[in-house]
Structures are given as structure tokens and as C-alpha cells.
């Protein structure tokens, strides 16, 4: 499995990093599934959206998510990279005006309706193997990633005690 690289080495003040442009550098419509090929689906229930991790039936259509990619500058005192220290941050929107948010207090992932500019809780640092196998690290809580727990999305702390081959924080992106 793909491991998140040396998380303990780079627990860094992501919330000090700045999005370098108000507009995304690119956007990508994709379905999101877990490393074990379960689909991430979104259902409107009582005027709010619920997020599920489930096996789809054979011909069932996968839900799509709009991933918007933003460039973000490392805090220069952190990275040592100067102007070169760029990360990719993403926001994930399954439907108009709703975005995935990190609720760090509850260790949960929620869908919130909001207007731009989006709050920091809606931004995730992109880690990837290729563009079709990724992990999402909370901008507001370095070392914490979107993951799968009990058939739901949750926030999962990845630290040195784990061997960093954590399949439950890996997601696949596909066009189908």
C-alpha cells in the first residue's frame, strides 16, 4: 500500500500557509472510492447531506465530486524552500454550494453549505501516488487525514506509531 510519507517529520503549521490564488489552478470531476473500492456516496436527508461509504450494486451510478486544486505556499520559515515551497490544496464539492469540511472537534467529515471564500476547514493538502490515488490532510490540523471508519468518513490521526501504510486514508479518483 501507499504510505503517507514521514508524517511525524512534517507536522507543520499548515494553517499559516497561504493559498496563493483565489481561483483554483484546475478543477477535476471524479468519483471517489476507498482503497478497497467502496464508493463514497452523498444522500440528501432532512435538508442536509449525509456521506456514506458503501458497496454499489453492479450498474449503480457513482456520485461525482468536483475537486478544485489550489496552490498554497508553505510558511517560508517552515519549509526552507523560499518561493519554491508549494503544496497542492483541494476542496471537494459533491453538489453546488456544498463542500466537505473537517470538524476537528468531533473528528468527523461533514458537508456544509457555504459561500466563497471557503473556510480553512474546507481545504485539504493533497498527497498522492498518482492523481488517481490520493490522501487528504486537514489544512487546519496537520497530521490528520480524511479516512474511513465504520463505513463513514472520519478524521484520522496518522502518526509515527502507525507504519504509514494506512489504507483507510487512501482514496481513488476515477472518471467513471
Amino acid at each position: 500500500a501507499f504510505g503517507i510519507s514521514g508524517v511525524q517529520k512534517y507536522t507543520r503549521a499548515l494553517h499559516d500557509s497561504s493559498i496563493t490564488g483565489i481561483s483554483p489552478i484546475t478543477e477535476y470531476l471524479a468519483s471517489l472510492s476507498t482503497y478497497n473500492d467502496q464508493s463514497i456516496t452523498f444522500a440528501l436527508e432532512d435538508e442536509s447531506y449525509e456521506i456514506y461509504v458503501e458497496d454499489l450494486k453492479k450498474d449503480e451510478k457513482k456520485d461525482k465530486v468536483l475537486l478544485s486544486y489550489y496552490e498554497s505556499q508553505h510558511p517560508s520559515n517552515e519549509s526552507g524552500d523560499g518561493v519554491d515551497g508549494k503544496m497542492l490544496m483541494v476542496t471537494l464539492s459533491p453538489t453546488k454550494d456544498f463542500w466537505l469540511h473537517a470538524n476537528n472537534k468531533e473528528h468527523s467529515v461533514e458537508l456544509h453549505k457555504c459561500e466563497k471564500p471557503l473556510p480553512d476547514q474546507a481545504f485539504f493538502v493533497l498527497h498522492n501516488m498518482h492523481s488517481n490515488c490520493v490522501s487528504f490532510e486537514c489544512k487546519t490540523d496537520p497530521g490528520v487525514f480524511i479516512g474511513v471508519k465504520d463505513n463513514h468518513l472520519a478524521l484520522i490521526k496518522v502518526d509515527s506509531s502507525e507504519n504509514l501504510c494506512t489504507e483507510n486514508i487512501l482514496f481513488k479518483l476515477s472518471e467513471t
Epitope: 501507499f2 504510505g3 510519507s5 514521514g6 517529520k9 512534517y10 489552478i25 484546475t26 477535476y28 471524479a30 486544486y69 496552490e71 508553505h74 519549509s79 526552507g80 524552500d81 523560499g82 519554491d84 515551497g85 508549494k86 503544496m87 497542492l88 493538502v125 493533497l126 498527497h127 498522492n128 501516488m129 498518482h130 492523481s131 488517481n132 490532510e137 504509514l164 501504510c165 472518471e175
Partner: antibody, heavy 121, light 106 residues
Framework: EVQLVETGGGLVQPGRSLKLSCVAS????????MYWIRQAPGMGLEWVSS????????YYLDSVKGRFTISRNNAENTVYLQMNSLRSEDTATYYC??????????????WGQGTLVTVSS | DIQMTQSPSVLSASVGDRVTLSCKAS??????LDWYQQKVGEAPKLLIY???NLQTGIPSRFSGSGSGTDYTLTISSLQPEDVATYFC????????FGQGTKVEIK
Amino acid sequence: EVQLVETGGGLVQPGRSLKLSCVASGFTFSNYWMYWIRQAPGMGLEWVSSINNDGGNTYYLDSVKGRFTISRNNAENTVYLQMNSLRSEDTATYYCAKGHYSYSSYSFANWGQGTLVTVSS
Amino acid sequence: DIQMTQSPSVLSASVGDRVTLSCKASHNINKHLDWYQQKVGEAPKLLIYFTNNLQTGIPSRFSGSGSGTDYTLTISSLQPEDVATYFCFQYNSGWTFGQGTKVEIK
């Protein structure tokens, strides 16, 4: 300023081995994916191998799988390409490159000057 | 595996001309495409990333566009220093270069 300096190229006989090194400076090496790309004389560019930040994941061009090994030493800011069972078709300038973004395998933002490997008897 | 096909192989144009280079992918690559410039005797240099984003320090006469399988690099007003070979490169699935387009001055 980002700098990548490749060494280790030279003339080698078919079937023999060679180890290329690339020393990096000017950026936080352990944050970035690193790559080897080659270019045969008068030909185009060909991606050869990739390694993620901590060296735990490596990827290879099919024609070099089982013969080449990419590795890195983050303490020494160095990425390596161990090339075994060399063939004449491996003759090329080998470039080391750095990823564009921390933690992501997108784009080659910076390149070294290249080191020439000639496989010939 | 994704194949990248560039056209033309060689392009000859006059200084000041608008020049268009094409790159076609064998599958949808979702704008995960770069353009690199390589001058004779030099290492390649990143010009454009994610289809249409200009790398820092690259002149604004260079621009990129495209989506799906079809991508374009445009030089709005060709300059003598633009003589080089241009490579497209996809990173949507694996890593693959096109074979290159050599740009010459007439």
C-alpha cells in the same frame, strides 16, 4: 536556489552495473518526490523511475523493471539510480528531477544538468 | 498505458508568428498535462503545468489549453530564443512524454 547535481555516468560494458547519484540542495528534500528521466542521443525524453518522499514507494518504466532500483537518503539529500544488467538501449543522458509540489507526484519543477551513460562493448 | 502523440514533429515559422503545437492523449488525462522546453545542449525546463498554468519566470507569450485528450501549446509571437524542442507530458496515470515538436525559425 534549487540545485540538482547528477554524477556517476560513464562508459560501461553491456551486462555490467552503474550507480547514479543526484545531490539536491536549496529545498526541503524530504518533502518532495524525486525522479529519473532519460534521453537517448538525438531522441525524446523518457520517464524512468519515481520515488516518493520517504522512499517507501517506487515506480519504474517497464523496460527497466527488475534491473534498475531507485532509492534515496533524506539525511544526505541524495537520490540514487542503481542500474544493473545494462543494455545498449540504456545509453542516454540521465536527468534527476524534483517534483513541483510537496507530497504530490505532479510535474518536474527542476532538473539537473544530466549525466551521460554509454553502454557499449 | 497512456500514449502521447505530438504534432507536427517539426514546425518552421517566422519571428513574430503565432505558433500552435498539438498533443493528443490516448485516454482522457483530466488536464494533468505539462509542457517542457528543451534547448540544444540544455536540460528541459517546465513551461506550463496542469494544462494552462504558466510556471514562474516563463514569458506570457506562452500559453496552454485543452481538456480530455486534446491539448495545445501556443506561442503568441515567436521569438528567436524560442527555438527548441517542446515536449508534452501527462501524469494522470503513470508518467508519459510525447515524442516532441522541434520549433525552428524560417
